[in-house]
């Protein structure tokens, strides 16, 4: 999977839309890397 | 309202340095990554590299290793991109950008720094 | 590096039509495509990401499509303000790269 930042960022958007937002307040596109998904 | 706030342009002689700043607002400066991107007549847009508010951690296109540092300023939320041993080849526009989730997912960019080298 | 084409340089057209603008990949790139619109004087504006995603803001005459190496941008029912470059750029590797642009022009 891809793994730039930009690639990162969008993902981790993606994921917060389907959650609803509800995920925890440090999981931003610089605390996470592409592992995390 | 999300805004990157650029320095004014510059006129500065070859073989000198300058320093670009990207002042941001409107969003948790240290949550999203920042790009840098050139664009001149010669090669439309150049990504340069970004840089990662939170740690500092950098990714620079191997052509503008050498030339281009990028920085941050936690404190004033801002960014920063020196560029090193200027020639005219290094005349043009170059921008900040972000792409931001929080308030508004969209990618932000700044309205551009004119950089002209010329003796 | 990889490099995005895009082979039409100028395009021309009417107010109300239909225009397709093309860039392709010099290899595989998945859905990592993003497309910019840059009026005259002006910064690039983000319109798609993941090939086909638009923001929000972006009008619905704005369509992105393609995958893999292949990649369109459609505009419908052209207005005279759609007058601008557009570019493409990959972000599925480093460095991310840009297509040279595409002018279109409203007769």
């Known amino acids: 999977a891809c793994d730039t930042a930009t690639c990162v960022t969008h993902r981790l958007a993606g994921l917060l839309s389907r959650s609803g937002g509800v995920v925890k307040n440090n999981f931003v596109p610089t605390n996470v890397g592409s592992k995390a998904f | 309202e999300v805004q990157l706030q650029q320095s004014g342009p510059e006129l500065v002689k070859p073989g000198a340095s300058v320093r670009i700043s990207c002042k941001a607002s409107?969003?948790?400066?240290?949550?999203?990554?920042m790009n840098w991107v050139r664009q001149s007549h010669r090669k439309s847009l150049e990504w340069i590299g970004d840089i990662n508010p939170n740690n500092g951690g950098t990714n620079y296109n191997q052509k503008f290793k050498g030339k281009a540092t990028l920085t941050v300023d936690k404190s004033s939320s801002t960014a920063y991109m020196e560029l090193r041993s200027l020639t005219s080849e290094d005349s043009a526009v170059y921008y900040c950008?972000?792409?931001?989730?929080?308030?508004?997912?969209?990618?932000?960019w700044g309205q551009g720094t004119t950089l002209t080298v010329s003796s | 590096d990889i490099v995005m084409t895009q082979s039409q340089k100028f395009m021309s057209t009417s107010v109300g039509d239909r225009v397709s603008v093309t860039c392709k990949a010099s290899q595989n790139v998945d859905t990592n495509v993003a497309w910019f619109q840059q009026r005259p004087g002006q910064s690039p504006k983000a319109l798609i990401y993941?090939?086909?995603y638009r923001y929000s803001g972006v009008p619905d005459r704005f369509t992105g499509s393609g995958s893999g190496t292949d990649f369109t941008l459609t505009i419908s029912n052209v207005q005279s303000e759609d007058l601008a470059d557009y570019f493409c750029?990959?972000?599925?590797?480093?460095?991310?790269?840009f297509g040279g642009g595409t002018k279109l022009e409203i007769e």
């Open positions: 750029q990959q972000y599925n590797n480093y460095p991310y790269t």
């Open positions: 409107g969003y948790t400066f240290t949550d999203y990554y």
């Open positions: 950008a972000s792409i931001i989730i929080v308030p508004n997912y969209f990618d932000y």
């Open positions: 993941s090939a086909s």
